[in-house]
Amino acid sequence: AVDLTLLANLRLTDPQRFFLTCVSGEAGAGRGSDAWGPPLLLEKDDRIVRTPPGPPLRLARNGSHQVTLRGFSKPSDLVGVFSCVGGAGARRTRVIYVHNSPGAHLLPDKVTHTVNKGDTAVLSARVHKEKQTDVIWKSNGSYFYTLDWHEAQDGRFLLQLPNVQPPSSGIYSATYLEASPLGSAFFRLIVRGCGAGRWGPGCTKECPGCLHGGVCHDHDGECVCPPGFTGTRCEQACREGRFGQSCQEQCPGISGCRGLTFCLPDPYGCSCGSGWRGSQCQEACAPGHFGADCRLQCQCQNGGTCDRFSGCVCPSGWHGVHCEKSDRIPQILNMASELEFNLETMPRINCAAAGNPFPVRGSIELRKPDGTVLLSTKAIVEPEKTTAEFEVPRLVLADSGFWECRVSTSGGQDSRRFKVNVKVPPVPLAAPRLLTKQSRQLVVSPLVSFSGDGPISTVRLHYRPQDSTMDWSTIVVDPSENVTLMNLRPKTGYSVRVQLSRPGEGGEGAWGPPTLMTTDCPEPLLQPWLEGWHVEGTDRLRVSWSLPLVPGPLVGDGFLLRLWDGTRGQERRENVSSPQARTALLTGLTPGTHYQLDVQLYHCTLLGPASPPAHVLLPPSGPPAPRHLHAQALSDSEIQLTWKHPEALPGPISKYVVEVQVAGGAGDPLWIDVDRPEETSTIIRGLNASTRYLFRMRASIQGLGDWSNTVEESTLGNGLQAEGPVQESRAAEEGLDQ
């Protein structure tokens, strides 16, 4: 909470002496526009309780962390609500003081009421000057409830608020009907956002147990300590006359904190200072009472005396809140009930004790389950305790069990038993499992069954190339996740082992058994390009491709040609097993089919990027044979062929192919293209004289069709030896295609 206190001086005989002071213990508070943030604000809040206008109040800043409001000219100036705002940013906090007129018709029995969410709040207005009229109750200035004047109980009007919620917080007032509002009893109700002993969002967190009347803040769980107390749980009393979160402030004047009301950040509210009570905080606590508003009871034992500021002051030899604890009997302090260590570790165990006479190193000992007594090797002596440190020999499983710390002095002895659990570090029973591999990485499942004790805190994977003497590489991984070993060498065997650890010093177990994991070949990175393809028949396709030129050896074993027949949903794969190959003949394809063709480099089992695909249409089965082929010799070196076009053509003829062979000859036939498909005759020239020839022909529509009948004809006699046959159509000579 913000260290902000609003003090009201309640010496009311003279209003002009009345003052309000706001004090901040925050670093750099109140410096205004400089780097330390906004200033302290102290003002009268007229939103709910309005008083007649008077001369303006005087605001005086005293140093960087104090501001005082003076200049009250008449008692009515004092009545109402005052607020102080301090702290920067999200810590900006408002502290509220509610002032009642001492001469009012009704006076509050208690001004500030701090209650928990869901509690019943009871506001009690005591009759000071009786009027026989109804009493109006208001909440934050708005009408709330009416009580008949007969309903006063024991001279008090009570307002019961059951099951209060935070929005019920605010300023409440009780006023006689038709009386001046200045004669009202004013109350402040603070409703914590949580039930008793809880704080935080959803009120799930437990308060620390604030002492001496401290109130647990429902947002941050800190104790807002009453004036005069300090510490995280308000366990410590300040010296008389001091206040603030660290007892750093001093009450003004010779009479200390007498006559001052202290208001602190919500949910504390306002009270007298420690040792004082009454409506004007001018009464000292009755014997046996202490603290703010004298709300706490001493109940001192063993000759302790009650100090109204700090509680029990114990005689020599006693301590405790009520002096109930003897200094003479030694006492083991804050010993854990259970400790856990790992096997074969040599832990240090601390044992702290207090007493009178003060325990020394030799008076504290540690006893193992087997009865062995250990003496401390070192002791740390502090004003309130001695801490002995024991160096335990290497732990074995038999050390599990109940150990005992014992302290002995002339004042007596004390002992505390605690359980020691010796745990066995985990050792993998199996090797890690390979999930996937690539050329430069292995994906491994590291979590395996193990002997020893969990939980597994870390998993280490150790790996290095097989048969290597180099240091192991180590990677620490999450036990529940697969791990990727990266930056490995392609086509290399790695020895991989797991090491498991459990929490605590010495929790690392032995390495598990090794396993061999081998990285894959390097991926073939080059993308081929299809450079060409041509149909060599209705079911044959010749494909050529290229590869980009890169420095270094080619990473690849060969090529994979893929032909996708989308109509039938079939893929054909052709393996070309030489990485030097750049062409392939694909046979046995389906005539008339539309194929999508691509090529990939492969290496081992890995495929490289595919070439952009090509779309290839194989011709349907070839056209029927040309009809009525006839041969007629024209000279000793020329024969004319005539024919009729085939019937029922599936498409336009692209060319005719004529086959020429010497009758009875052993050589290969010659093929001659007739590239003008509209022709029905052609002259074959360059033949030998007096030679018998065989002719046949076929048409081509993308693919070659069926052969015609074979015809025979002889050239005329006695010519010279020709160079070889050529074909001449009516228009032009054409080349020979063998």
Partner: antibody, heavy 118, light 107 residues
Framework: EVQLLESGGGLVQPGGSLRLSCAAS????????MLWVRQAPGKGLEWVSV????????FYADSVKGRFTISRDNSKNTLYLQMNSLRAEDTAVYYC???????????WGQGTTVTVSS | DIQMTQSPATLSLSPGERATLSCRAS??????LAWYQQKPGQAPRLLIY???NRATGIPARFSGSGSGTDFTLTISSLEPEDFAVYYC?????????FGGGTKVEIK
């Protein structure tokens, strides 16, 4: 310095044509596959077309097939994209890019804007 | 066609923080995946190729990992100049396809 510089973009009516050019410098052009990628306003990258180093093979995205033609002139170190029958959805910044042997699209031009609007 | 899906669409981070961008392919693309960076009004720039190799001149704070269908681009400590859109792209099969992009913006 390895550089690609596109040109030929502009405003054209639906159904119209444009020819984009991409001039390459700072590297030997002929051994590399080249491609066009486009980016519609406020959208991601879309591959359009690719051509092999020799120019013998071309391939197109379905969205432009039959309307766009990619070509190259290795003697002039230039890549082309002939765009016909343009539609409003062809509005984009067109980038030419080099297809590295092992790296993918390793060099990009600065882009040229094509707007198809009536 | 292979679909590439990037997540998240937007990543709001402060300079110095670590950025982790994901890319998932609808089928295996082996390690043939590239990452590109694009700043407003500029052409894309190749950062990572073949899943984990840094392109020439790319700082060591950029790293790529993954194979098959799941890939990650990590920027170990964001510099002011790293706030941009990042695309992944597969080159395993044609058509080469890009992810929808992840915008890394200043928180």
């Amino acid at each position: 310095e390895v550089q690609l510089l596109e040109s030929g973009g502009g405003l054209v009516q639906p159904g119209g044509s444009l020819r984009l050019s991409c001039a390459a410098s700072g590297f030997t052009f002929s051994p590399y596959g080249m491609l066009w990628v486009r980016q519609a306003p406020g959208k991601g990258l879309e591959w359009v077309s690719v051509i092999s180093p020799s120019g013998g093979q071309t391939f197109y995205a379905d969205s432009v097939k039959g309307r766009f033609t990619i070509s190259r002139d290795n003697s002039k170190n230039t890549l082309y994209l002939q765009m016909n029958s343009l539609r409003a959805e062809d509005t984009a910044v067109y980038y030419c890019a080099r297809l590295g042997a092992e790296k993918g699209m390793d060099v990009w031009g600065q882009g040229t804007t094509v707007t198809v609007s009536s | 066609d292979i679909q590439m899906t990037q997540s998240p669409a937007t990543l709001s981070l402060s300079p110095g923080e670590r950025a982790t961008l994901s890319c998932r392919a609808s089928q295996s693309v082996s390690s043939y995946l590239a990452w590109y960076q694009q700043k407003p009004g500029q052409a894309p720039r190749l950062l990572i190729y073949d899943a984990s190799n840094r392109a020439t001149g790319i700082p060591a704070r950029f790293s790529g990992s993954g194979s098959g269908t799941d890939f990650t681009l990590t920027i170990s400590s964001l510099e002011p100049e790293d706030f941009a859109v990042y695309y992944c792209q597969q080159r395993s099969n044609w058509p080469h396809t890009f992810g929808g992009g992840t915008k890394v913006e200043i928180k």
